[in-house]
Interface confidence: low
Amino acid sequence: SQVSQNCHNGSYEISVLMMGNSAFAEPLKNLEDAVNEGLEIVRGRLQNAGLNVTVNATFMYSDGLIHNSGDCRSSTCEGLDLLRKISNAQRMGCVLIGPSCTYSTFQMYLDTELSYPMISAGSFGLSCDYKETLTRLMSPARKLMYFLVNFWKTNDLPFKTYSWSTSYVYKNGTETEDCFWYLNALEASVSYFSHELGFKVVLRQDKEFQDILMDHNRKSNVIIMCGGPEFLYKLKGDRAVAEDIVIILVDLFNDQYFEDNVTAPDYMKNVLVLTLSPGNSLLNSSFSRNLSPTKRDFALAYLNGILLFGHMLKIFLENGENITTPKFAHAFRNLTFEGYDGPVTLDDWGDVDSTMVLLYTSVDTKKYKVLLTYDTHVNKTYPVDMSPTFTWKNSKLPNDITGRGPQ
């Protein structure tokens, strides 16, 4: 049935899907607070621009009876059930904000005739790449992959004089939603990462990972994993590690590394942490005071989704253009808008660009220090610390092939 959009005559509605199955186990109340805070800002910005319009959000809840795993495993059906709910109510907003699970977003995109934009806080998987009306406000797997390939190929920095072409990937199936899809992308045989590497093996058991740390016959010195320092410690403990081993710990949505009083534990000395550049400051707002760093990023993405809608609404209204058109649905890309915590840039496919930061542990200070940054928008690495106090020999990253250390 044809669903009418509540999106004209000075009244503009946002449909927010409040799904029990979510990329992060975040109380829906916090997401509501984030959306409402975003609405306040949008209303103010529109008012300041002389646009006397109404902007509201409708929260669409699933019944939670059937789809109650709480993670993304049963999200496909939950997403479609919510769309059915919208269809039955014959009422849809100008924009759909909500599905964060890759499964649900992919299926909803397939099963709907999307003449409206869909904004996601999540949908990290490669299957959600290049969707014409989908915008993703948390770094998708493709961005991580491009960084890794760029870094592997780099060989002209004082601290990295070898190109790498090999890697182990540790993936045991217990990962969080973001990590699951990041590692899934690295594992996929058809992905850019796999295509560019000569050797890549996925380690699925704790023992496999632990054995590699001191295995003289290992095929690569580099191991990629995803999670926080505690996750690594559970796996690695205080085991000895060969001096040429480099562990790349992907922990994008965690800004604890940048806090002044943080000291890196000893087990992190062989580790390079890949994270996102922290916001202008740690958030201190009504919706985020009690959130962990990851949840803060998730709630922030919801809030930024509202601000993005406000940004596009303002542009279209100022130009006298219709909101319920394919042009509007396809416009949420290739732009920069004023986000809650700084400017937010979306690439040509509506995916958020960011500055990734690679950290190392200084053997002198036991602090995390920035080794380099990477701008996903221009796919470029910027070295920061030209003389890092590494644990590795000669303060240089080793070759990725055992037995050919720094020369």
Partner: antibody, heavy 117, light 109 residues
Framework: QVQLQESGPGLVKPSETLSLTCTVS????????WSWIRQPAGKGLEWIGR???????SYNPSLKSRVTVSVDTSKNQFSLKLSSVTAADTAVYYC???????????WGQGTLVTVSS | EIVLTQSPGTLSLSPGERATLSCRAS???????LAWYQQKPGQAPRLLIY???SRATGIPDRFSGSGSGTDFTLTISRLEPEDFAVYYC??????????FGQGTKLEIK
């Protein structure tokens, strides 16, 4: 029309704290970022720091240890405090609306603060 | 830290002439985050150009901006008497969050 007006003492003694207030009219202080920028006589511009909703701030690293920017939404004002001042902090101080995508579209007229005993 | 270097330090031209002011960054700057300002003696800076090439409200079309990466240019196609002032470029997005060039003084020849 958006207008910004700086106010505060024009003379501060060395080692004391410089305090300035910017009063905003024509725009709600809650809906934008707001920055402080200074300019020593005959020299270039230096960004000091910014504030946004709920008092969230970011500062120029070179001044971070001495700077506090705060906001009073009820008065539509934001303020600057710079502690332990020296003669090098003598400058014209401007408040400005910060559009985040990299530019300042409205500025106050500036206020000269001299640090001298 | 990104350092912006403007050249020339002083530019002497006559009304009616074309002025080309340069701003070079020590590392790449996103074109979304580069702006130009005009400042006259005793006045606050005035925004001319933002996002490298977008003119601010009320700025005449003789002012234009261009560039990408590390090299940016402000062009005044035909100088008017009121255009003689100091011009600053400014970037956002790298630590410190925001920085300005040292300025180019445009004076009457």
């Amino acid at each position: 029309q958006v207008q910004l007006q700086e106010s505060g003492p024009g003379l501060v003694k060395p080692s004391e704290t410089l305090s300035l207030t910017c009063t905003v009219s024509g725009a709600s202080i809650s809906h934008y970022y707001w920055s402080w920028i200074r300019q020593p006589a005959g020299k270039g511009l230096e960004w000091i720091g910014r504030i946004y909703i709920s008092g969230r701030t970011s500062y120029n690293p070179s001044l971070k240890s001495r700077v506090t920017v705060s906001v009073d939404t009820s008065k539509n004002q934001f303020s600057l405090k710079l502690s332990s001042v020296t003669a090098a902090d003598t400058a014209v101080y401007y408040c400005a609306r910060d559009r985040l995508t990299g530019y300042f579209d409205y500025w106050g007229q500036g206020t000269l603060v001299t640090v001298s005993s | 830290e990104i350092v912006l270097t403007q050249s020339p330090g002083t530019l002497s031209l006559s009304p009616g002439e074309r002025a080309t002011l340069s701003c070079r960054a020590s590392q790449s700057v996103s074109s979304s985050y580069l702006a130009w300002y005009q400042q006259k003696p005793g006045q606050a800076p005035r925004l001319l150009i933002y996002g490298t090439s977008s003119r601010a409200t009320g700025i005449p079309d003789r002012f234009s901006g261009s560039g990408s990466g590390t090299d940016f240019t402000l062009t005044i196609s035909r100088l008017e008497p009121e255009d003689f002032a100091v011009y600053y470029c400014q970037q956002y997005g790298s630590s410190p969050m925001c920085s300005f060039g040292q300025g180019t003084k445009l004076e009457i020849k």
